[in-house]
């Protein structure tokens, strides 16, 4: 049976004073002679020789200064032999445990720390965890680790605190605006021994970003704006509306959506927002008439692509700014509305026969035009002929057969209207059906026709007359009527609704 | 690199005898402590035996007097010799060495060992 | 009867973190370092953990080792498939004069 002892050794200074630090003895002794043997890391492995047993006394000395974090112990393997080498006892493993001394600073992970945290955070909220380690025996006062901040960069009040033992960076209020510091800098220092004033210490930085959140209400630089705006006309560049949100540039929080409260019902204006600069700009998208609106008022508002943060959510007010349009008048001059009209002519009709009126409106007075005359444009097989005060449109004479196959039966002429005044020229067009070539018929014109217009109204008459609404062209401008005018003329019984 | 051969397993009746071998490579059998263990079908691992010199073997308390485990150096062999086998007996016996951690660090193939009338 | 006790089964899912124990007295696990071995089904064990809590060459970081008074314990980290095993805790017992060896612990992953 064997009997042993051994104590441990101290890492970083000389043991021998402590020798033998192990002893070992078989009572096989007590009938025959033993020698020791002993093997293992740091006796016959390296690092070798670090041990050394006196055979016959089993006494173990140590020889030379170790490490414990290299080797936190050594597992000495002990035989008892006989005098042919046989073994006299079942090998005997004995552990030499090294005591641990304060040899190793902390070591953090990393140089600098990143960490981000959002402004307006609640306080104790994480921001980031620091990391560091310490070579010393775990679970022992040498590898504790206290954690401290020592320095923060702006330094104008503490925003920050440390666990001391676990290196997490919290909040400490819910004071962090972004609006006032973008950054902050922390200096962070780990001490061992618990923080204790024998300890070693190591430092790191840490980098905190404070994130935006939509917690600043835009507002435009001004309350109120005056225009003009000519009548007929588009504009891309009305008016620059600039806002003012102290949030994060170029974010969605920052970034402003300009709308329409009211004044806007036309649908004439739009604002296109410029996200690099924060600047709207009003844009007239829809021709405004001086006849019908001389002035508007327009009422926007202002808010952010992002929601608002709940901090302010109850701060918000729609804070309307006004915009007076003034419209200007545009001396326009007569055109035909509709610039369209499609007339039947019936195979019985013959030289002067009314076909129509084709008359140009004065867009400053919504009236027919007294100051224009009308003259035929563009005139197939030479059909039609025009009053030039009145615009009243007649055959010249009894359609050919000739002239109805030249036409196929269909007629496209053009009707001038000239203003001398103004220098100015429309043009109306005009379609015609020939019907029934070399029949008498009167088609579609028998009395009491029932005929239902588009205003849903129903008309019992012998004579009829539709224009058809289509999109006249004059020089300057587009202007798209809107049908369901109903019957506004009843003419000869020679006009048809309709191509 | 170190191996272990193994040899010996049969079938038997109960009372009978029958001899184990182990042949190593990559080491001397006299250099080494050798164990053999055993496990029964469906069962964990139980320690047979363990030389350690020519003067110093232990032995499992179920094997004690019937069991007897010997080296040979020239062969650089390991026996295990089994004698009044009983059914119990019956499992994988495999031979294993015991390096200079007191471990057993390197195990044979296992052989069957079935004791049965 | 056996003389170290360990649970007859463990499960876990892969990437899971296990441990298995190993219970025993003063005579054994108390005065003696522990060893632990893998056995793939119909294959010889293999040593995983000696003296404790040393690692053989060859065996991955994954699997740690560590005694406290008369128990031990073998943690297998980041779990994989090819862990599926039976494990056996073992060493010397001063009184019956003889290795010891657990009952074992089927690992099961999930």
């Known amino acids: 049976e064997w009997i042993k002892f051994a104590a441990a050794c101290r890492e970083g200074e000389d043991n021998s004073k402590r020798n033998p630090i192990a002893k070992i003895h078989s009572d096989c002794a007590a009938n025959q002679q033993v020698t020791y043997r002993i093997s293992g890391v740091g006796i016959d492995q390296p690092p070798y020789g670090i041990f050394v047993i006196n055979q016959k006394t089993g006494e173990i000395n140590i020889t030379s200064i170790v490490d414990r974090e290299v080797t936190p112990f050594f597992i000495i393997y002990c035989r008892a032999l006989n005098s042919m080498g046989q073994d006299l006892e079942r090998p005997l493993e004995l552990r030499v445990r090294v005591l641990d001394i304060n040899d190793n600073p902390p070591v953090f992970s990393m140089a600098t720390f990143a960490g981000q945290i959002e402004e307006n955070s609640n306080a104790n909220t994480l921001v980031m965890i620091l990391n560091a380690t310490d070579a010393d025996e775990p679970n022992n006062l040498n590898s504790k680790i206290a954690f401290k901040i020592i320095r923060q960069e702006p330094s104008d009040s503490p925003m920050f605190i440390i666990n001391r033992n676990t290196g997490e960076i919290r909040t400490m209020n819910n004071f962090l605006d972004r609006e006032q510091y973008g950054q902050y800098a922390l200096a962070v220092r780990g001490s061992d021994r618990d923080g204790g004033a024998d300890g070693m210490s190591a430092e790191c930085e840490c980098n905190i970003k404070i994130l935006d959140v939509n917690d600043n209400i835009p507002y435009m630089e001004q309350s109120s704006y005056t225009i003009e705006i000519q009548e007929n006309t588009l504009n891309s560049n009305l008016l620059e509306i600039r806002v003012i949100d102290l949030d994060e540039e170029f974010s969605a929080n920052w970034m402003a959506v300009i709308f329409f409260i009211s004044g806007n019902e036309g649908n004439w204006f739009e604002i296109e927002m410029n996200e690099r600069t924060n600047v709207g700009i009003l844009k007239v998208v829809k021709p405004l008439d001086y006849e019908a609106m001389q002035s508007l008022q327009l009422s926007i508002g202002v808010r952010n692509k992002a929601e608002f943060h709940h901090s302010i959510m109850s701060q918000y007010k729609l804070k309307a700014s006004a915009i007076s349009v003034t419209v200007l008048n545009v001396i326009e001059g007569p055109v035909f509305r509709p610039g369209s009209k499609t007339y039947v002519v019936t195979g019985n009709m013959g030289s002067n026969d009314k076909v129509g009126d084709f008359v140009a409106t004065d867009l400053d007075t919504g009236r027919p035009s007294t100051t224009v005359r009308y003259v035929m444009g563009n005139n197939p097989a030479d059909l039609l002929a025009v009053d030039s005060r009145t615009g009243k449109l007649t055959l010249k004479n009894k359609v050919t057969k000739e002239q109805y196959n030249m036409l196929g039966g269909k007629y496209q002429g053009t009707i001038l209207s000239i203003d001398d005044n103004l220098q100015r020229t429309c043009t109306g067009t005009i379609n015609i059906n020939i019907q029934s070539f070399g029949n008498d018929d009167r088609t579609n014109t028998e009395p009491n026709t029932k005929i239902t217009t588009n205003t849903g109204r129903q008309e019992s008459t012998s004579s009829t007359n539709y224009d058809t609404s289509t999109t006249s062209t004059d020089s300057s401008q587009v202007y798209s009527s809107e049908p369901g005018n109903g019957a506004k003329d009843l003419l000869s019984d020679n006009v048809h609704f309709g191509p | 690199q170190v191996q272990l051969v193994q040899s010996g397993g049969d079938l038997v009746q109960p009372g009978g005898s029958l001899r184990l071998s182990c042949v190593a490579s990559g080491f001397n059998v006299n250099d080494n402590y050798m164990s053999w263990v055993r496990q029964a079908p469906g069962k964990g691992l139980e320690w047979v035996s363990t030389i350690y010199s020519e003067t110093l073997s232990y032995y499992g308390d179920s094997v004690k007097g019937r069991f007897t485990v010997s080296r040979d150096g020239s062969k650089n062999t390991v026996f295990l010799q089994m004698s009044s086998l009983k059914g119990e007996d019956t499992a994988v016996y495999y031979c294993a060495s015991e390096g200079g951690g007191l471990t057993i660090d390197y195990w044979g193939q296992g052989t069957l060992v079935a004791v049965s009338s | 009867e056996l003389v170290l006790t360990q649970p007859p089964s463990a499960s876990g899912t892969p990437g899971q973190r296990v441990t298995i124990s190993c219970s025993g007295s003063s005579s054994n696990i108390g005065s003696n370092t522990v060893n632990w071995y893998q056995q793939l089904p119909g294959t010889a064990p293999k040593l995983l953990i000696y003296?404790?809590?040393q690692r053989p060459s060859g065996v991955p970081d994954r699997f740690s080792g560590s005694k406290s008074g008369t128990s031990a314990s073998l943690a297998i980290s980041g779990l994989q498939s090819e862990d599926e095993a039976d494990y056996y805790c073992a060493t010397w017992d001063d009184s019956l004069n003889g290795r010891v060896f657990g009952g074992g612990t089927q690992l099961t992953v999930l």
């Open positions: 003296s404790n809590n």
